[in-house]
């Protein structure tokens, strides 16, 4: 989690003038609490927006708005605790809003915003808008929270990012997959223009189970620069067990700016339609 | 292939726990966490909570909060869930989900039955 | 808690029909919502996320739509495969919640 790193961060407007600073996410009003706080934001909004850096890279930001209640309780309110926490790992991003001016009742409801926190691919968080000072202990809550879920690479707008465009979203493979006599699968991809290994991992099924039966890795070396872009044509073997016949390729590439971590895709091959014939029903019932 | 294997089926009496496990596969353990969810027999689902496979924190429903126990064992790739002082209304399939907002991966579910 | 409400409770249609489902949210969860298919006796399957989005490996005949608190799962043309029951799941708020299930059966 991290702030975009451009322009300097403003939170004034009409009629409030409020500096956007740092925050270790503990606010001294947890430890000094006041008698008289502010209510809760109002319709908290989260949106996945795209901003660029002052270097032209195109990151997800959680864009963060939401309005003030129309109570006298804004006279109290000092400013707001913005706060992003990534789900898993726990990790927690917060900057405050700090007013230098009272807040005064006028003709529009008081809405904020704030497009700065950058979000990863693929990741869920936590975004939690908090009013300046804090509830007293056991006082009614004064913040909103909203889940927040961005979408993974193969989202069309997410995928001309700078972290998607880093781990591969622009290479197409365009696999196919043909299914040869003596058990045997070729598998054809497009090559991306860099030169890195690949790995094709093959995983059979049988028909409508999702455990596997077969289990295979092929390595692919580096291509030279004349082969960047062509197709490679790999033909795997398969093991000959009965009804494992549902077969899940995908390939893995290694580029130089994600490594291990690389978007995979993959291209599954289905088992071959049953004939419609009904089995024969054996005229003795075996006792065992 | 991301997998989710979960323990077998399970027969308790009114009282007693249960604990099913959640074996990961397929994708790094710690990147996403776990959800659990069940479905009474005929029922819709509903959401029980989930762990951080990361930090080892936990959001459970309220519905479940101080009955509930939900943990993970890294080096084993496996996530918990124990539901303590069973009733016959917890008679469900009991499903591990990967991640917490979206559940992508789903176990093939764990068949808790309770009676007496 | 938040209350999801599908309509109808099941419907009836035949191979290739277009199939839509709608899910109701009791408050906004804006684009915080999920479909989920599900067979008897197996897991759910997520089919969307985030109202619209379609899961990796899902058939494009799926798509989904909406904000607020009206949503819609729509099936092109409706496959052998897909007779099962459907589930809608919002995210935006805790606790999670599903709706209560719709349950597509053949005509």
């Known amino acids: 989690l991290r702030l975009l790193d451009h322009r300097a961060l403003v939170c004034s407007q009409p009629g409030l003038n409020c500096t956007v600073k740092n925050s270790t996410c503990l606010d001294d009003s947890w430890i000094h609490p006041r008698n008289l706080t502010p209510s809760s934001p109002k319709d908290l909004q989260i949106q996945l927006h795209f901003a660029h850096t002052q270097q032209g890279d195109l990151f997800p930001v959680a864009h963060i708005e939401w309005t003030l209640q129309t109570d006298a309780s804004i006279l109290y309110l000092e400013g707001a605790e913005l706060s992003v926490l990534q789900l898993n790992t726990n990790e927690r991003l917060c900057v405050r809003f700090e007013f230098l001016s009272k807040l005064r009742h006028h003709h529009r409801r008081w809405r904020f915003t704030f497009s700065h926190f950058v979000v990863d691919p693929d990741q869920e968080y936590e975004v939690t808008v908090h009013h300046l000072p804090k509830p007293i202990p056991d006082g009614d809550p004064n913040h909103q929270s909203k889940n927040f879920l961005v979408p993974d690479c193969e989202h069309a707008r997410m995928k001309v990012t700078t972290p998607c465009m880093s781990s591969g979203s622009l290479w197409d493979p365009n696999i196919t997959v043909e299914t040869l006599e003596a058990h045997q699968l070729r598998v054809s991809f497009t090559l991306w223009n860099e030169s890195t290994h690949y790995q094709i991992l093959l995983t059979s099924f049988p028909h409508m189970e999702n455990h596997s039966c077969f289990e295979h890795m092929h390595h692919i070396p580096a291509p030279r620069p004349e082969e960047f872009h062509q197709r490679s044509n790999v033909t795997l073997t398969l093991r000959n067990l009965k009804g494992c016949c549902r077969h899940q390729v995908q390939i893995q590439p290694f580029f130089s700016s994600c490594l291990n971590d690389c978007l995979r895709h993959s291209a599954t091959v289905s088992c071959p339609e049953m004939p419609d014939t009904p089995e024969p029903i054996p005229d003795y019932m075996p006792l065992w | 292939q991301v997998q989710l294997v979960q323990s077998g089926a399970e027969v308790k009496k009114p009282g007693a726990s249960v604990k099913v496990s959640c074996k990961a596969s397929?994708?790094?353990?710690?990147?996403?966490?776990i959800s659990w969810v069940r479905q009474a027999p005929g029922q819709g689902l509903e959401w029980m909570g989930w762990?951080?496979?990361?930090?080892?924190?936990?959001n459970y429903a309220k519905k479940f909060e101080g009955r509930v126990t939900m943990t993970t064992d890294t080096s084993t790739s496996t996530a918990y869930m124990e539901l303590r002082s069973l009733r016959s209304d917890d008679t469900a399939v009991y499903y591990c989900?990967?991640?917490?907002?979206?559940?992508?991966?789903w176990g093939q579910g764990t068949l808790v039955t309770v009676s007496s | 808690d938040i209350q999801m409400t599908q309509s109808p409770s099941s419907l009836s249609a035949s191979v290739g029909d277009r199939v839509t489902i709608t899910c109701r949210a009791s408050?906004?969860?804006?684009?915080?919502l999920n479909w989920y298919q599900q067979k008897p006796g197996k897991a759910p399957k997520l089919l969307i996320y985030?109202?619209?989005n379609l899961q990796s490996g899902v058939p494009s005949r799926f798509s989904g739509s909406g904000s607020g608190t009206d949503f819609t799962l729509t099936i092109s043309s409706l496959q052998p495969e897909d007779f099962a029951t459907y589930y809608c799941?919002?995210?935006?708020?805790?606790?999670?919640?599903f709706g209560q299930g719709i349950k597509v059966e053949i005509k």
């Open positions: 989900a990967r991640r917490v907002l979206r559940l992508d991966y």
């Open positions: 397929g994708y790094g353990f710690a990147s996403r966490g």
């Open positions: 762990i951080s496979t990361y930090s080892g924190n936990t």
């Open positions: 408050q906004s969860v804006h684009t915080g």
């Open positions: 985030g109202a619209s």
């Open positions: 799941q919002q995210f935006e708020h805790n606790p999670l919640t």
